[in-house]
């Protein structure tokens, strides 16, 4: 019915019987309800359940209750269901953002870069080029830069310097290594997880796309390609690096240097001789899914001041 | 017993202004709203718009505003229908309501050269 | 604007039938609907609200059905007084409007 709706007191609204042009103060119904019948002068109001689909999220005062939103279009999830006290609420899955109204990959940070600022399911990643002293070898959405180990501190010598996509190769001082095999021709060079935080990936790290939950899903990882030496200035049409490649890097000297190397991991590196072949396979690296915030997808725009 | 007494008939000129008047009784003027309703022979029934004498507070049909003013006197507990810029248009009995159930008795407008 | 379709226009009758009259809302008003009657040359009554509640004062021939968007006034018993115009107005939303009116007449 038309009302004027003037602000009350707290658990009662303003209600115009129609027939007799009388304005009386009703009690509000509870959340989850809707008033199917006014008071009058000689009745309370009458409250009713939310039907199937609609909600009320306040004690209220209005006829019939909100309709919920649509069901999460893909490849949303809801976050909240349809119910008589709350309203559907979408949003987008692990490794997505919301991007006009749908949901697009988290950026990849390709390698050299790190993730600058975390991505939610409302922003995307922002990633940034590794400074001086750090690096980041994998392509990832999650991976900050980390620093390289410090083989000095190590009591390790530097056998190969890092670079922005790579780590420092540490190596034992022959000389003075009490470590050192008698099997000539083998050094054993370290390669310390370094202390410095970092996220700990949740799931494994696939190219081609996301672990979405949406099999249909076409979004694909896009991998943040730098165009200069700036932060986020970096397109993404490009494809990304493959999540598994090899990576043998040989010494100075012949043989070769088997490094495993995961952000994860504590891994040893050994100088084998060169009879012995390596076929270091980079280990898995993962995508974190992001913490979920609440966002209000396709929120109600209407304003009952007889719900509030 | 509730009463709304109106004006009796008026006769205006085209341009001129009228102003009818709703004298109510028999209840608290300041917690009802009262409306005003137009019926031309012929035309039917139009509802003008509706006043709450409580804090003066007014609504309009679209196509009566700009033409049609309501006031209210909580003194004399009477409410006011003012015409402006008339014509012939405008020739019709008016009503006052209490709600729909209760009704004043009307006013016949008559505009004419 | 809700449009209020009422029928018939006009009708004859005789003392002691029984009538009815309808009236649909362009769109559903529940139940927010009256009916008011109108004698020659003189104002209106209200004779039912809610679509179904009587109006003190009025006789239990009249009754009033319906809800969402189709209603109805029934008249049984028709007396000589009961011969008037009769109009529906739905007040579930502003502008409220009223249907077109049924003239009731002695045949």
């Known amino acids: 019915q038309p009302e004027q709706k003037t602000l009350s007191l707290t658990g009662t609204y303003r209600h115009v019987d129609r027939t007799t042009g009388q304005v009386l103060t009703c009690d509000k119904c509870p959340a989850g309800t809707y008033v199917s019948e006014h008071c009058t002068n000689t009745s309370l109001r009458v409250c009713s359940s939310c039907p199937s689909g609609t909600f009320t999220r306040h004690e209220n005062g209005i006829e019939r209750c909100h309709d919920c939103s649509q069901p999460c279009p893909r490849p949303m999830i809801e976050r909240l269901p349809c119910a008589a006290l709350t309203d559907r609420e979408c949003i987008c899955p692990p490794g997505m953002y919301q991007s006009n109204g749908t949901c697009a990959p988290h950026t990849v940070c390709p390698v050299g870069w790190g993730v600058r600022k975390k991505g939610t399911e409302n922003e995307d990643v922002r990633c940034k080029q590794c400074a001086r002293g750090t690096f980041s070898d994998v392509p990832s959405s999650v991976m900050k830069c980390r620093a390289h180990t410090d083989c000095l501190g190590q009591n390790l010598m530097v056998v190969k310097q890092g670079t922005k996509e790579t780590d420092n190769v540490c190596g034992v001082h022959l000389s003075s290594s009490s470590t050192t095999p008698s099997s000539p021709g083998i050094a054993t060079f370290s390669h310390p997880e370094h202390t410095e935080s970092h996220d700990v990936p949740s799931s494994t790290y696939e190219p081609q796309g996301m672990n979405s939950t949406d099999s249909n899903s076409t979004a694909s990882v896009r991998t943040k390609v730098p165009s200069d030496i700036q932060e986020e200035t970096v397109p993404d049409n490009t494809s990304s690096t493959s999540g598994k490649e090899s990576t043998n890097r040989t010494l100075p000297n012949p043989p070769q240097l088997t490094h495993q190397q995961g952000p994860h991991h504590r891994h040893i590196l050994k100088l084998l001789p060169s009879s012995m072949e390596a076929t270091g396979e980079k280990s898995s690296t993962a995508i974190k899914a992001p913490k979920r915030g609440h966002p209000r997808q396709n929120p109600h725009k209407h304003f009952d001041i007889n719900e509030h | 017993q509730v009463q709304l007494q109106q004006s009796g008939p008026e006769v205006a000129r085209p341009g001129a202004s009228v102003k009818l008047s709703c004298k109510a009784s028999?209840?608290?003027?300041?917690?009802?709203?009262l409306n005003w309703v137009k019926q031309r022979t012929g035309q039917g029934l139009e509802w003008i718009g509706e006043i709450y004498p409580g804090n003066n507070h007014t609504y309009y049909n679209e196509k009566f505003k700009g033409k049609a003013t309501l006031t209210a006197d909580n003194s004399s507990s009477t409410a006011y229908l003012q015409f402006s810029s008339l014509t012939s248009e405008d020739s019709a009995v008016y009503f006052c309501?209490?709600?729909?159930?209760?009704w004043g008795q009307g006013t016949l407008v008559t505009v004419s050269v | 604007d809700i449009l209020m379709t009422q029928s018939p226009s006009s009708m004859s009758v005789s003392l002691g039938d029984t009538v009815s009259i309808t009236c649909h809302a362009s769109q559903g008003i529940r139940n927010s609907i009256g009916w008011l009657q109108q004698k020659p040359g003189k104002s209106f009554k209200g004779l039912i609200y809610?679509?179904?509640t009587l109006e003190d004062g009025v006789p239990s021939r009249f009754t009033g059905s319906g809800s969402g968007a189709d209603f109805s006034l029934t008249i049984s018993s028709l007396e000589s007084e009961d011969f008037a115009d009769y109009y529906c107005?739905?007040?579930?939303?502003?502008?409220?409007?009223f249907g077109g009116g049924t003239k009731l007449e002695i045949k």
């Open positions: 107005v739905q007040y579930a939303q502003f502008p409220y409007t």
């Open positions: 309501t209490r709600g729909v159930i209760k």
């Open positions: 028999g209840y608290t003027f300041t917690d009802y709203y």
């Open positions: 809610h679509a179904t």
